[in-house]
């Protein structure tokens, strides 16, 4: 070994050199939580840049660059360091049009931390691991997921856009000149019946055990559908985002309250299905699969 | 193709009566807004005669108050209108309109579905 990388890799493995770093980083990070910093805050931010490079040069003297089995880019946690380097050296000598789109990567500086602290690292390889592990129960979630919201698709399609519609109009109206004028807030109000605090039409449905509409209106499928129209079952896509909404548990009592009051009482099966399979089961089983991947990356 | 059936049209004397139906009898009929009779004079826009709601509030046009009686058969799923006292201006071709939701077996449409028309003749 030449004598520089033998101080390289003295340097290296002292723990003075670690806290440097951990240090370093924390306080750049301190730095960019800054609103309006002042200028000289410029000139610590190129040295933080040279701390950083004179780190990656240590582990490139002591390691090797690339050729060789534990050389500096044969550790991916490197490549973080690396790519900081010349993102610090891009957003500040090289003229590019958007720098502030270049400047976000600077935060990656933060991800610094992990490879410094070694408990981050094991929760970081932890999950690292678990996502490859998570590819088979993902796939069947996915799978789960469509073939229901196949099932939502058949069932409610459309559903959503029943509304209690006034029983009286002008003498020239009829209702679908009425469905080619509805336009502003102000009309769907004037035609449909809305409950007192709602943002979207009362949703009723024509089979007995749906929701009847009051004295007065009518149920009829005209307009969009709720919450802005993202609420729907009218296509493959927003079933399957309905679905996932069932299995995250997100507000899905509205959704399950919604498709039961335009589509009927009976249909409350479809939901039991869907939360016990997709909320309780899969989402334990991928809580499992993480759960485990940790153990293996403790031992 | 959803279709509404018309009958009752027919010749009649100035001052006569005609009693013109509209069934919706088809399953693919499920619940109206209102169910209304339209005429349409040669040459002239169609026009509203009288309508009825699904609840059984009716309205009617100036030219037709006090002299026509709209009415419906919920079991049946007809409208009925009668017309008294007709007058020649009262010749035209007379419509239904069914002014609510259909099934088409796979989902449900709202719209407006007209009948093909019966011809109503007042002439001595």
């Known amino acids: 070994f030449s004598p520089l990388r033998r101080i390289s890799i003295k340097i290296l493995v002292h723990s003075l050199f670690s806290m440097l770093i951990m240090c370093t980083i924390l306080t750049n990070c301190i730095f960019m939580t800054m609103n309006n910093p002042p200028d000289w805050t410029k000139n610590v931010e190129y040295t933080f840049t040279g701390i950083y490079t004179f780190e990656s040069l240590v582990k490139i003297l002591a390691r090797g660059f690339c050729v060789g089995e534990f050389t500096f880019l044969r550790d991916p946690w490197n490549w973080l360091d690396f790519v900081v380097i010349v993102f610090a050296y891009l957003t500040e000598f090289v003229n590019l049009g958007n720098v502030s789109a270049l400047r976000t990567f600077r935060v990656l500086r933060a991800l610094k931390t992990i490879s410094v602290i070694p408990g981050l690292k094991t929760i970081v390889g932890a999950l690292i691991q678990s996502v490859k592990k998570l590819s088979d129960v993902m796939i069947l979630t996915v799978f789960c997921l469509s073939v229901f919201a196949l099932i939502g698709l058949q069932l409610f399609m459309g559903n959503l856009k029943h509304k209690c519609f006034r029983n009286s109009l002008e003498n020239n109206e009829t209702l679908e000149s009425i469905m080619n004028t509805l336009e502003s807030e102000e009309d769907f109000r004037k035609y449909f019946y809305y409950l007192e605090g709602s943002k979207d039409a009362l949703l009723c449905g024509f089979s007995t055990d749906s929701g009847q509409c009051p004295e007065g209106y009518t149920c009829v499928k005209i307009g969009r559908n709720p919450d802005y129209g993202y609420t729907s079952f009218d296509t493959f896509s927003w079933a399957f985002l309905a679905l996932f909404r069932l299995m995250t548990q997100d507000y899905w009592e509205n959704l399950y309250q919604q498709t039961l009051r335009a589509a009927g009482k009976t249909y409350m099966i479809f939901f039991v299905v869907v939360i016990f399979l997709g909320s309780f089961y899969l989402i334990n089983l991928i809580l499992a699969v993480v759960a485990m991947a940790y153990e293996e990356q403790n031992q | 193709e959803v279709q509404l059936v018309e009958s009752g049209g027919g010749v009649v004397q100035p001052g006569g009566s005609l009693r013109l139906s509209c069934a919706a009898s088809?399953?693919?009929?499920?619940?109206?807004?209102?169910t209304g009779w339209y005429r349409q004079a040669p040459g002239k826009q169609r026009e509203l005669v009288a309508r009825?709601?699904?609840?059984?509030?009716?309205n009617y046009a100036d030219s037709a108050k006090g002299r026509f009686t709209i009415s419906r058969d919920n079991a049946k799923k007809t409208v009925y209108l009668q017309m008294n006292s007709l007058r020649p201006e009262d010749t035209a071709l007379y419509y239904c309109?069914?002014?609510?939701?259909?099934?088409?077996?796979?989902?449900?449409?709202?719209?407006?579905?007209w009948g093909q028309g019966t011809l109503v003749t007042v002439s001595s």
């Open positions: 309109l069914f002014s609510g939701t259909i099934s088409t077996g796979r989902e449900y449409r709202s719209g407006d579905y």
């Open positions: 009825i709601y699904n609840e059984g509030n009716t």
């Open positions: 088809s399953r693919q009929f499920i619940r109206d807004v209102f």
